[in-house]
Structure formats: C-alpha cells, structure tokens
C-alpha cells in the first residue's frame, strides 16, 4: 500500500514527489489532489503546476518548497488539521507518453500527545516503523519500502516522537 507520512496538528506536513526532467529544465505539468489518483488528472485538486510555475492553489497552505525546476514537486501543507488526513495523489503529467506517473501517498495527522519521556530510549524513528514522520520543512525524502518493518500503534509513535524530541534528537521529515 501507499507509504504513510505522519504530522501533528498545527505542524507542517511534507509529502514527497519528484521526477527527473528530461532534458534538464524541461518541466512537465504536475497536479496534487486529495484522494487517490483517478483514471485521469487529479480529483479535488489542491495544487497544479504548468511547464513554468505553480498556476493553481486552492489554499495558501499548499506549497512546493523544493527545487521545483529540478523536478522536486513535494507538497508542503502548512498548519495541518485532522481534516487534512487521507490519501493524496501526485500526478506527473508527462506529455507525449501514454501514461502519467501516479503516486499515492497517505497523510496521517495526529493530535499532539503529552507522554512522560523516557530519556534512555535512543532509537531512530525511521527504523521503528514503516511510516515517515513529517514535521515541517526538512527533506529530501527518505525512501523506504512500505511494510518492510514491523508496524506499531500510535501510542508507540507518540512515545518515540516525544522521547526523541525531548532528548534533542532531530526528527527527519520524509
């Protein structure tokens, strides 16, 4: 299934998507939509680019903050709410080719949890579970095969998140 990315309410979420312009600088249209990629295009479009720039955003919370001109079309959603949870489609609309590149990613927005820290735990979040934590502006994305690691429940995620944050560790955005 699609890779999950986790963000806390009020934080920024980062959903990775990229392609390699060929030749370099030869950009193609891209759309981001809320909901799995449909048969064509994107449904419930939140952001759309043309061959030069972003030309359609449904809200000022949606941004492409990566190097758009090098094919980094990762979506940043600012100040996420629980309503932002769900599957998003990044569709790279390659002209002259019969098939667009379709990428479905899942955003899970969680409420900030207040958990008593256990400072002895020093463990890399990305090896703890097959979901990616997303807390803002970092990047680039780290790729990981979904389902290749044991799953954990949200309580464990809360605990790991807070323990790492409280111990000063950096939580990488994926």
């Amino acid at each position: 299934s699609e890779v999950e990315y986790i963000a806390e309410v009020g934080q920024n979420a980062y959903l990775p998507c990229s392609y390699t312009p060929a030749p370099p600088g030869n950009l193609v249209p891209v759309c981001w939509g809320k909901g799995a990629c449909p048969v064509f295009d994107c449904s419930n479009v939140v952001l759309r680019t043309d061959n030069r720039d972003v030309n359609d955003r449904t809200s000022g919370r949606y941004w492409l903050k990566g190097d758009f001109h090098k094919g980094d079309v990762s979506l940043t959603i600012e100040n996420v709410t629980l309503a932002d949870s769900g599957v998003y489609c990044c569709r790279i609309q390659i002209p002259g080719i019969m098939n667009d590149e379709k990428h479905n990613v899942k955003l899970v927005v969680i409420k900030p949890a207040k958990v008593t820290p256990a400072p002895t735990l020093q463990r890399d979040l990305t090896s703890a579970f097959p979901r990616m934590l997303t807390t803002g502006e970092h990047g680039p994305a780290e790729t990981q095969t979904p389902g290749s690691l044991p799953d954990v429940n949200l309580t464990q995620i809360f605990t790991l998140t807070n323990e790492l944050r409280d111990s000063g560790a950096t939580i990488r955005t994926a």
Partner: antibody, heavy 114, light 107 residues
Framework: EVQLQESGPSLVKPSQTLSLTCSVT????????WNWIRKFPGNKLEYMGY???????YYNPSLKSRISITRDTSQNQYYLQLNSVTTEDTATYYC????????WGRGTTLTVSS | DIQMTQSPSSLSAYLGGKVTITCKAR??????IGWYQHKPGKGPRLLIW???TLQSGIPSRFSGSGSGRDYSFNINNLEPEDIATYYC?????????FGTGTKLEIR
C-alpha cells in the same frame, strides 16, 4: 449530475464506417476526459480511447488505424468513428466519463452484418 | 496491454450469503483497480475504486481488497438486486483493461 446518451445506427454493413454520437448534459466537454468503451456479445469489455478537455486524444493501439474521436463543444457532443468495420465490431458501445468511470450512458447496440 | 484474469466466470450463491471474486493482473497495478456491476439494458455502475474505496451511495455489503497483482471483491449478505455481471478494471496503465466478468446468480 452528468448524463450521457449514445446514438447512432443499429446496423452497419461490413467495410463501412461506423459513426456514433455521445450527447452530454450536466457538464461541459471542454473539461475532463470523455471516453468510449464497448462490450462484445461474449461480455468482454474493451477500452477504446478518449478525447479530453483540450481536444487531445488517445486510442487503444488495437484500433489505432481505424478509430477517430472528435468533439463539438458548441453542441456538447463527442463522436466515435470506426472505419472498415467487420462482424467483430458487433458490440454495445458506451460513452463514459468521471474520475473512476463513474458515469456511463445506457449504451447503443451495433450489429455489423451484410 | 495488462491482462486481467478474473475468476470465477460465473457463480451461484444463496440469499444472505457471501461471494468473492478475484482478479489477477499480469503486472503490479499499484492498487489502481475499480469494480463495476453491470445489469442488462443499463450502463455499468461503479462500486469500488482504488481497490477498496466504496463509491458514494454504494452499500457497505460491497468491499474490495488487494495489492500488487492480486485483487478481490466481496459481497456480503447477498440480496436479489445483486444479480448482475461484475467486472474489475485496471486503470494504472493505458490502454485500461477489464477482467473477463463474473456472472452472479442467486440460488
């Protein structure tokens, strides 16, 4: 809600050209993608192709040399033309649209026979 | 083209019972699968998209699952109006291709 209605002849002779019309209400054919799909007597469904909001087309390679999909935005209609038909083209033809092929016409049944 | 192998081609089940239909794609279609119900004289009706998402207005008796090359479709608590032919569709790659269909009858 989008509604589609197919129209055209019910009988065509082999080697002739088939022309079908899809009349669309509830949406403009200057947006989205507009498809043709057919169902053969043995129940097999085949995707034939589309015309989209900009007038770009895609045709199933199995039909490429014989098929043409066009549109008339002023009439809000799009069309299927299939050349050099044979008895193998006997089928029910559907016009279809929607994010996941949500909207289908009722279909028009075509028999190719001499 | 991506061939979709659907089975069984027909099945018969009791009212209130459960049926399962499967589709196997020749290659990974990344969950880009829809399921349709077709009754004579009508256009096919979308039931499920993206493998498991129920289309608006479709009863929760219908469900789908799968990933990679293997997909399945279930109807629980069969009702008389479920008599129809059911198809899977892969929309991952053009040309989009349908399964061969499963004709459902009620005993």
């Amino acid at each position: 809600e989008v509604q589609l209605q197919e129209s055209g002849p019910s009988l065509v002779k082999p080697s002739q050209t088939l022309s079908l019309t899809c009349s669309v209400t509830g949406d403009s054919i200057a947006s989205a993608y507009w498809n043709w799909i057919r169902k053969f007597p043995g129940n097999k469904l085949e995707y034939m192709g589309y015309i989209n909001y900009s007038g770009s087309t895609y045709y199933n390679p199995s039909l490429k040399s014989r098929i043409s999909i066009t549109r008339d935005t002023s009439q809000n209609q799009y069309y299927l033309q299939l050349n050099s038909v044979t008895t193998e083209d006997t089928a029910t033809y559907y016009c279809v649209t929607g994010d996941y092929f949500d909207y289908w016409g009722r279909g028009t049944t075509l028999t190719v026979s001499s | 083209d991506i061939q979709m192998t659907q089975s069984p081609s027909s099945l018969s089940a009791y009212l209130g019972g459960k049926v399962t239909i499967t589709c196997k794609a020749r290659q990974d279609v990344r969950k880009n699968i829809g399921w349709y119900q077709h009754k004579p004289g009508k256009g096919p009706r979308l039931l499920i998209w993206y493998t498991s998402t129920l289309q608006s207005g479709i009863p929760s008796r219908f469900s789908g699952s799968g990933s990679g090359r293997d997909y399945s479709f279930n109807i629980n608590n069969l009702e008389p109006e479920d008599i129809a032919t059911y198809y899977c569709l892969q929309y991952d790659n053009l040309p989009f291709t349908f399964g061969t269909g499963t004709k459902l009858e009620i005993r």
